[in-house]
Amino acid sequence: IYIFISDTGRPFVEMYSEIPEIIHMTEGRELVIPCRVTSPNITVTLKKFPLDTLIPDGKRIIWDSRKGFIISNATYKEIGLLTCEATVNGHLYKTNYLTHRQTNTIIDVQISTPRPVKLLRGHTLVLNCTATTPLNTRVQMTWSYPDEKNKRASVRRRIDQSNSHANIFYSVLTIDKMQNKDKGLYTCRVRSGPSFKSVNTSVHIYDKAFI
C-alpha cells in the first residue's frame, strides 16, 4: 500500500532547491529521477537545463507519481542538471538533480618531453606523462622502462581537477644518475576500466656533450 499525504505548499516529497541532489547513473541502465509527489494528480515536467524538456513516452521515459521519472535506458542525453517542475495554485516549484556518470574514456595521453630524449650520463631523467579524461573518470597510470627490474625510477602522481570540463592526471617518472643501462624505450600506460592508451619515448645516453 502507498499513501499520498497531500501538501499544496510542498508538491515534491523531497525538495532539492539549494544544492542539487547527485544521482549516479550508468549509460544503458535504468535511471530514476526520484521526484515523487505528495498528490497523484500533480502534473510534473522533467527538464534538462538549460533548454531541453524530457517527454515521458510511456516506454523509455515513464512518469510514476510514487517514484518519479523512470528512464529505462539512460543515455548521455540524461547527463546534466535535471529539474522536476510542478505548478500548484499558480506557484512554480522545482527540485533539482545532478546526474553523474562514471566513464572510462581516455581523451589523450602525452609525454611532455622532446622525442627522442638525449641525456648526458650521470644526469637526471624526468618524464612527465599527462592523461586527459572527461570528468567522473579515474585512471591507473604505469610506466615500463629498461631497468625496471631494479626499480630505478621514482614515480609521483597528481590530479588537476581545476578544469571544469576534464580531469588531468600526471605521472612523473624520475631516474637519478642515468647510466647506459637506462637507455631505451620508456612507455607510459594509462588504463580506465576496459579503455587503454599508451605513449612512449626513446631515451639516448651520451658520455659527454657534443655538437
Epitope: 537545463f49 538549460p50 533548454l51 548521455y76 542538471l81 512554480l92 522545482k94 570528468l135 570540463h165
Partner: antibody, heavy 119, light 110 residues
Framework: EVQLLESGGGLVQPGGSLRLSCEAS????????MNWVRQAPGKGLEWVAT????????SHAPAVKGRFTISRDNSKNTAYVQMNSLRAEDSAVYYC????????????WGRGTTVTVSS | QSVLTQPPSASGTPGQRVTISCSGS????????VYWYQQLPGTAPKLLIY???QRPSGVPDRFSGSKSGTSASLAISGLQSEDEADYYC???????????FGGGTKLTVL
C-alpha cells in the same frame, strides 16, 4: 587546455550582416549548451542567445529575436551567431561561453570579438 | 535596464569585508540558481560562484555567495587589491527562457 575562440567580428554598416564563429577545443563540445553574450563599451553583460547541446533548441534575447540566429556544428566543434539587420546598438564585444555539466553556469568564456556597426 | 538589480559601485579597504547585493523576481532568482562573475579590466568574465554558494576550483574561499527568496548576495572577505573588478550576478529566467544579468558592480579597493 579548454578554450573558446571567437572570430568574425569587424566593422559593418547599419542594416548589414555578420557571422560570428566560436571554435571550442579541449573538451567534449557536443555535450554542452553554448551561449553568446555581448558587452557594449562601458556597459554590462547582456545575454544574446543559447543553444542546446544537440543544436535542436535555441533561445534568443528579445532585443535580437528575428535578426540573430544561433547555431552549431558539433562535427566542427563550433558555435555560430548569424547577425542580420545590424543596428548601431548592436556594437559590442561578443563573447561565447559554454554551460557545462559541472557548474551549469557560464564557466568557460572566449576572449571576445568586437563588432562595430557604424556608417 | 537590467533584469537583475545591483548597486553600480562598492568599495572597501584591504582586509575589509564587502557585500554586493543582487535583486530579482520569482521568475529568475527565486526559482533558479544564482551565478556570480568577476570581470577584471580588459578581460572576459570569469565564473566565481555557482549554485548560489558553490566555488569552482581555484576560487579563494574569501568569496562566498548566498540566496534568499528573490535576492542574492556576494561577500568578499579579506579584501585584496587584485579583487578590484566588475562583478555581475546572473541566473536563468523562466519567463524569458534565457539568461539574465545584473548591471554590474564596480568594486574599488581603496
Amino acid at each position: 587546455e579548454v578554450q573558446l575562440l571567437e572570430s568574425g567580428g569587424g566593422l559593418v554598416q547599419p542594416g548589414g550582416s555578420l557571422r560570428l564563429s566560436c571554435e571550442a577545443s579541449g573538451f567534449d563540445f557536443s555535450t554542452y549548451a553554448m551561449n553568446w553574450v555581448r558587452q557594449a563599451p562601458g556597459k554590462g553583460l547582456e545575454w544574446v542567445a543559447t543553444i542546446n547541446s544537440e543544436g535542436t533548441i535555441t533561445s534568443h534575447a528579445p532585443a535580437v529575436k528575428g535578426r540573430f540566429t544561433i547555431s552549431r556544428d558539433n562535427s566542427k566543434n563550433t558555435a555560430y551567431v548569424q547577425m542580420n539587420s545590424l543596428r548601431a546598438e548592436d556594437s559590442a564585444v561578443y563573447y561565447c561561453s559554454s554551460t557545462t555539466g559541472t557548474t551549469h553556469g557560464m564557466d568557460v568564456w572566449g576572449r571576445g570579438t568586437t563588432v562595430t556597426v557604424s556608417s | 535596464q537590467s533584469v537583475l538589480t545591483q548597486p553600480p559601485s562598492a568599495s572597501g579597504t584591504p582586509g575589509q569585508r564587502v557585500t554586493i547585493s543582487c535583486s530579482g523576481s520569482s521568475s529568475n532568482i527565486q526559482n533558479n540558481y544564482v551565478y556570480w562573475y568577476q570581470q577584471l579590466p580588459g578581460t572576459a568574465p570569469k565564473l566565481l560562484i555557482y549554485f548560489n554558494s558553490q566555488r569552482p576550483s581555484g576560487v579563494p574561499d574569501r568569496f562566498s555567495g548566498s540566496k534568499s527568496g528573490t535576492s542574492a548576495s556576494l561577500a568578499i572577505s579579506g579584501l585584496q587589491s587584485e579583487d578590484e573588478a566588475d562583478y555581475y550576478c546572473g541566473t536563468w529566467d523562466d519567463s524569458l527562457n534565457g539568461w539574465v544579468f545584473g548591471g554590474g558592480t564596480k568594486l574599488t579597493v581603496l
